[in-house]
């Protein structure tokens, strides 16, 4: 029917914008479209340098730089709450000239029974209550309004949604006589979107729902629901996309099985299975239909929920994610790594890489780390010579490019970037590791030896001598 939103499978482009767009209000800058780079493809670096130089020279003229902070707004609908019944909320920094909105979901694990929720309440209360939230937050990484720190979307409207529901953004139950805690993660997102519509989101062209760790999983669980909500509220033209950072977990076999006692040693499948019941968790409808009743926990795992999603989603995941290793009971303490553990770690990277093979928009460096997109130095890591902001820019272009009915990637603008080398930090652009005792930065070779990887074993599959490999790694190749 006329005006009905047509949801797109990931990797497909949105319909071209209508020819007659409403004229911007007087004094409002026109939102720019991605540039057509075809004419300058050969000399892209020099062109980008000129654009950056121009942006930086114009930047001091704007009022944007006067206040870097995002300001706290507690929800007006106080029935949508954090775990302890205090109102949920969001931090906002408006960018009036932009029709791009970035909504970021914070991470911070979860709790799945009264005991570990009580303990969390007495240790990490800011993740369960808004009572002590600061009035402002500084935007970092992808939430920064500085073009130097955020070359991707520095001019967007920035929204940081604090995580205070402990339910991987999936819960839909309120506090009551029976329930000591409210778990309203899914409802918090819906309510934030509803309130933002009155603050300018109604005029948005693109809404990017992003998140890290539990927030990254929250993106996968909520992105289609946000798109459906906007459509139902009469905003079918807002393109909803997802950016899931460090939230793509595997329900693999733990290195050492432990009983489900606390949050970080409980096998993820068991923790989520218990959590869903405790939180009254909701999962994407299309995914839920693929599994039997009681098996909804499957939808918390990226590789299972992703094929059911309609909105385009970009997946960012370290191949050796620290949270994944933690729930798998792998604890790297600098003691020599036994062969069984080394093979387990390498296999984890291989399995994760395999789950991303059909994810057209992905960035997966072979590093041992956790979370990236709101780190100040999120621009530093590269996969196959491409940084994450650049890959996201290419993703934007691929979604905007209306003649992209063919699946061929844009020339010189890759979006599927998954490291193929097989061990932690084999990518020389990985975040630096420091030696615990000296505080000195370690290069990749030092790090691998520090972890107990035998250089002979590491070099052999590459068809190299240990000395050759050490030389290559020390040179950052």
């Amino acid at each position: 029917s006329e005006g009905r939103k047509t949801w797109r499978r990931r990797g497909q482009q949105p319909p071209p914008p209508p020819r007659t767009e409403a004229a911007p209000a007087a004094g409002q800058p026109v939102e720019s479209f991605p540039l057509d780079f075809t004419a300058v493809e050969g000399n892209m670096d020099s062109f980008m340098a000129q654009v950056k130089s121009l942006a930086q020279s114009l930047y001091p003229c704007s009022a944007q730089q006067l206040n870097e902070d995002l300001r706290l707004h507690l929800l007006l609908n106080t029935s949508v709450t954090c775990n302890d019944g205090s109102p949920a909320g969001y931090y906002l920094k408006e960018s009036r000239g932009s029709r791009r909105w970035l909504l970021f979901l914070e991470g911070g694990w979860y709790c799945f029974n009264r005991e570990n929720c009580d303990s969390r309440y007495d240790t990490m209360r800011r993740l369960m209550s808004s009572r002590d939230w600061p009035r402002t937050r500084t935007g970092t990484g992808i939430l920064s309004s500085q073009p130097e720190e955020n070359p991707y979307w520095w001019n967007a409207n920035m929204v940081f949604i604090p995580y205070c529901s402990s339910d991987v953004w999936s819960g839909a139950s309120s506090k009551s006589e029976k329930n000591e805690y409210a778990f309203m993660g899914a409802l918090i997102i819906q309510e934030v979107v509803r309130e933002l519509l009155g603050r300018g989101l109604s005029g948005a062209k693109v809404l990017l729902l992003a998140g890290s760790a539990a927030g990254g999983t929250g993106v996968l669980l909520n992105v289609d629901r946000v798109a459906e909500q906007l459509e139902k509220l009469g905003y079918p033209a807002i393109q909803v996309r997802g950016l899931a950072d460090s939230g793509w977990f595997l329900d693999n076999k733990q290195y050492r099985h432990t009983d489900c006692v606390d949050t970080i040693t409980c096998a993820p499948t068991e923790a989520i299975r218990r959590g869903i019941r405790y939180w009254n968790g909701v999962v994407p409808e299309r995914c839920r239909r693929q599994f039997q009743e009681g098996e909804e926990w499957n939808c918390f795992f990226g590789y299972k929920v992703y094929p059911t999603l309609r909105c385009p989603v970009f997946v960012v995941q370290w191949l050796f994610d620290e949270a994944q290793l933690t729930v798998d009971n792998v604890h790297l303490t600098g003691q020599p790594v036994q062969e069984g553990l080394r093979l387990y770690i390498q296999n984890l990277g291989r399995e994760l890489r395999h789950t991303l093979k059909d994810v057209p928009a992905s960035f997966a460096p072979a590093c041992l780390s956790h979370e990236i997109i709101i780190r100040s130095h999120w621009t530093d890591v590269q996969v196959k010579g491409t940084s994450l902001p650049r890959a996201l820019h290419c993703w934007d272009r691929s979604l905007h490019d209306s003649h992209k009915a063919s699946k061929t990637p844009l020339k010189g603008c890759p979006v599927h970037l998954v490291d193929s080398c097989p061990w932690p930090h084999c990518n020389p652009s990985c975040p630096t590791v420091r030696d615990q005792f000296t505080g000195q930065e370690m290069n990749v070779a030092q790090f691998l030896m520090h972890m107990g990887f035998d250089m002979q074993t590491v070099a052999q599959p590459q068809g190299l001598e240990p000395s050759e490999l050490l030389g290559m790694l020390s040179n950052g190749s």
Epitope: W109, T123, M124, R125, A214, T263, E322, T326, E371
Partner: antibody, heavy 119, light 111 residues
Framework: EVQLVESGGGLVKPGGSLKLSCAAS????????MHWFRQAPEKGLEWVAY????????YYADTVKGRFTISRDNAKNTLSLQMTSLRSEDTAMYYC????????????WGTGTTVTVSS | DIVLTQSPASLAVSLGQRATISCRAS??????????MHWYQQKPGQPPKLLIY???NLESGVPARFSGSGSGTDFTLNIHPVEEEDAATYYC?????????FGSGTKLEIK
């Protein structure tokens, strides 16, 4: 002034019982999870027990489970540790401590009360 | 339980020099930008005193010569310049899960 003061320590025979108390003042007691720790002579710090801010959840170290009971009275701003079936290895200085709810560190400690288990 | 390995067990530092104490956890104690590791000072006959919380935050009233750093599993307490009154035993403690555990302590002696 924010303060914790322990009392109730003393000399007791093996198999005997003792009840320690910790009086809190200068802060909203009901907002904080509370812990008991102990330190044997010339030894390090050992965690003993925890009670959540609302008393719903309690945890014990394996070494005291089934013998010690932690409780609190938020109306009276007091924390207690009932110790039974005492052993010589329970001899230590016992401290109560306030756990900060945004970090889980112990920012306020009592001065301690000595428990000696000896025949 | 998370085991905290503190090193060295004791150290002697000259007045005005730097003292560095390390603490390694058997599991990652950081999440969502916070590292749940803390440092305490204890003098004979006194209860422990909080110095540094959440890896790097100085407790109010603690001199700025104390600083903490680290994330994941590896953490460090630095004291610089060391003063006479810093002679004490220092403990690290995590609060990532129950039970909270402490390192075995580092005894600092001033030369």
């Amino acid at each position: 002034e924010v303060q914790l003061v322990e009392s109730g320590g003393g000399l007791v025979k093996p198999g005997g019982s003792l009840k320690l108390s910790c009086a809190a003042s200068g802060f909203t007691f009901s907002d904080y999870g509370m812990h008991w720790f102990r330190q044997a002579p010339e030894k390090g710090l050992e965690w003993v027990a925890y009670i959540s801010s609302g008393s719903r959840t309690v945890y014990y170290a394996d070494t005291v489970k089934g013998r010690f009971t932690i409780s609190r009275d938020n109306a009276k701003n007091t924390l207690s540790l009932q110790m039974t079936s005492l052993r010589s290895e329970d001899t230590a200085m016992y401290y109560c401590a306030r756990k900060h709810y945004n970090g889980g560190y112990f920012d306020v400690w009592g001065t301690g009360t000595t428990v000696t288990v000896s025949s | 339980d998370i085991v905290l390995t503190q090193s060295p067990a004791s150290l002697a530092v000259s007045l005005g020099q730097r003292a560095t104490i390390s603490c390694r956890a058997s599991k990652i104690v950081s999440t969502s930008g916070y590292s749940y590791m803390h440092w305490y000072q204890q003098k004979p006959g006194q209860p422990p005193k909080l110095l540094i919380y959440l890896a790097s935050n100085l407790e109010s009233g603690v001199p700025a010569r104390f600083s903490g750093s680290g994330s994941g599993t590896d953490f460090t307490l630095n004291i610089h310049p060391v003063e006479e009154e810093d002679a004490a035993t220092y403990y690290c403690q995590h609060s990532r899960e129950l039970p909270p555990t402490f390192g075995s302590g580092t005894k600092l002696e001033i030369k």
